[in-house]
Amino acid sequence: QRLPRMQEDSPLGGGSSGEDDPLGEEDLPSEEDSPREEDPPGEEDLPGEEDLPGEEDLPEVKPKSEEEGSLKLEDLPTVEAPGDPQEPQNNAHRDKEGDDQSHWRYGGDPPWPRVSPACAGRFQSPVDIRPQLAAFCPALRPLELLGFQLPPLPELRLRNNGHSVQLTLPPGLEMALGPGREYRALQLHLHWGAAGRPGSEHTVEGHRFPAEIHVVHLSTAFARVDEALGRPGGLAVLAAFLEEGPEENSAYEQLLSRLEEIAEEGSETQVPGLDISALLPSDFSRYFQYEGSLTTPPCAQGVIWTVFNQTVMLSAKQLHTLSDTLWGPGDSRLQLNFRATQPLNGRVIEASFPAGVDSSPRAAEPVQLNSCLAAGD
């Protein structure tokens, strides 16, 4: 099923299993179960770090309720400006009934543009990546991640939001796409298929991978997600393909082993902190980058997508667990939660490495059809 060019030294070749300390089994809700009455020094009195599944629904921001139980934890959070700018809070409280963007699903009515007009935009995601047409940009430097190694406490919320499984990340996970292009990680979630059916969102020369991880980030230039939506570079997503390998991936197992606890739509559990970077490929220097959108409503554009060239390997059993454990809306299995690829409409995908150079002996001269734009600006 893999394309001939998927070798160790070719685009998207070679997996990274990502190791982390094995951590003990966990209990149900703890750390940030409910809005906090008092936050740590330097933080406003805001609700605790909250969900933002998928690149999913933008919540309507509601005032903090006096009753902790009255708030619904959902979807793309709004990050409030904290008392100290260094530590944002992911504030995703909203009432489900009050948000039209909660009423969407994969493969059916209502059409997404009716849910959010931006879904009919010209520069949408995901896209098909054709390495031969990618513009090699030497200015694209290795990604820098800081603070992605988390101790087991505080625990993190893992939630089945009906569209994906999402891990809400605490403040302090910093990512740089390059000088002056700094972001804070908010959440990560996965997209997958079904038995024998791959479910990555992005494709490579038409090839769909078994699954895909997205780590969603907010630019440090913005205090809140709703301020950043639709603004160029306001949000950035790191994406990596997951494919089958011979061994169990211990980093992913820390999440996959907990999926049975959240099989039901809307359920959540708490998992020990882990090395978030171990969920990503080890090679931060080779990637594709383009400007697109959120892949779920509200489909806001201006999102910088960084798709790793290297894949992450999970065992066959792990991929099966991912695609066959969770339930979505209407007593249906949560499967095939990916959006169809969208037209580039003139966009050029950039590569941090010469992805267009074919390793076969036929290519005497590297074929690079697109030139690098102002990468790194």
Partner: antibody, heavy 118, light 111 residues
Framework: QVQLQESGGGLVQPGGSLRLSCAAS????????MSWVRQAPGKGLEWVSA????????YYADSVKGRFTISRDNSKNTLYLQMNSLRAEDTAVYYC???????????WGQGTLVTVSS | QSVLTQPPSVSGAPGQRVTISCTGS?????????VHWYQQLPGTAPKLLIY???NRPSGVPDRFSGSKSGTSASLAITGLQAEDEGDYYC???????????FGGGTKLTVL
Amino acid sequence: QVQLQESGGGLVQPGGSLRLSCAASGFTFSSYAMSWVRQAPGKGLEWVSAISGSGGSTYYADSVKGRFTISRDNSKNTLYLQMNSLRAEDTAVYYCARSHSSGGFDYWGQGTLVTVSS
Amino acid sequence: QSVLTQPPSVSGAPGQRVTISCTGSSSNIGRGYNVHWYQQLPGTAPKLLIYGNTNRPSGVPDRFSGSKSGTSASLAITGLQAEDEGDYYCQSYDSSLSAWVFGGGTKLTVL
């Protein structure tokens, strides 16, 4: 405002037991992991044990594993440390501390002194 | 012997700048875990001074700053004041020990 108040310290013989308590107020107790940190007289800080907000996960320093048990009662906003088989080297001021989302300890109690001596 | 190594003491005159180092290993600071700093004034409980390597809680003067590089971290104090005198501790998490670890502490003396 956040307040943590330890109690239960005192003089105990080697091999004896003691139960420390930490009463918390001013924040949603069940939403935070908590830890015990100790400081022997004239010495530095040593992390002893930690517990998740639900109480479902517990962690211990090697020096106390099998002898100390951390627990919490979220309905009473109280953290506990049950100390058994106490040794002279357990003599210290014991602080309870709240876990910050970054992995540090953002609020500390004033401490309670535990003296293990015959 | 502490997992994180700090100098036992540092000193400086009022108004001066001092730095306190904290050296770890590839299983703690070098692994990427956050470093935090605490101030313990004589006879009092420790107080969080810097969290997440570089961040100051509200109420902590900007004379205090933290940095981290490789397997070590540093706390810098500028414009030294008499009331800064006390013990300073660094702290991180160690994946080999599966434990939260502290430095041995540094006694700051304001001359």
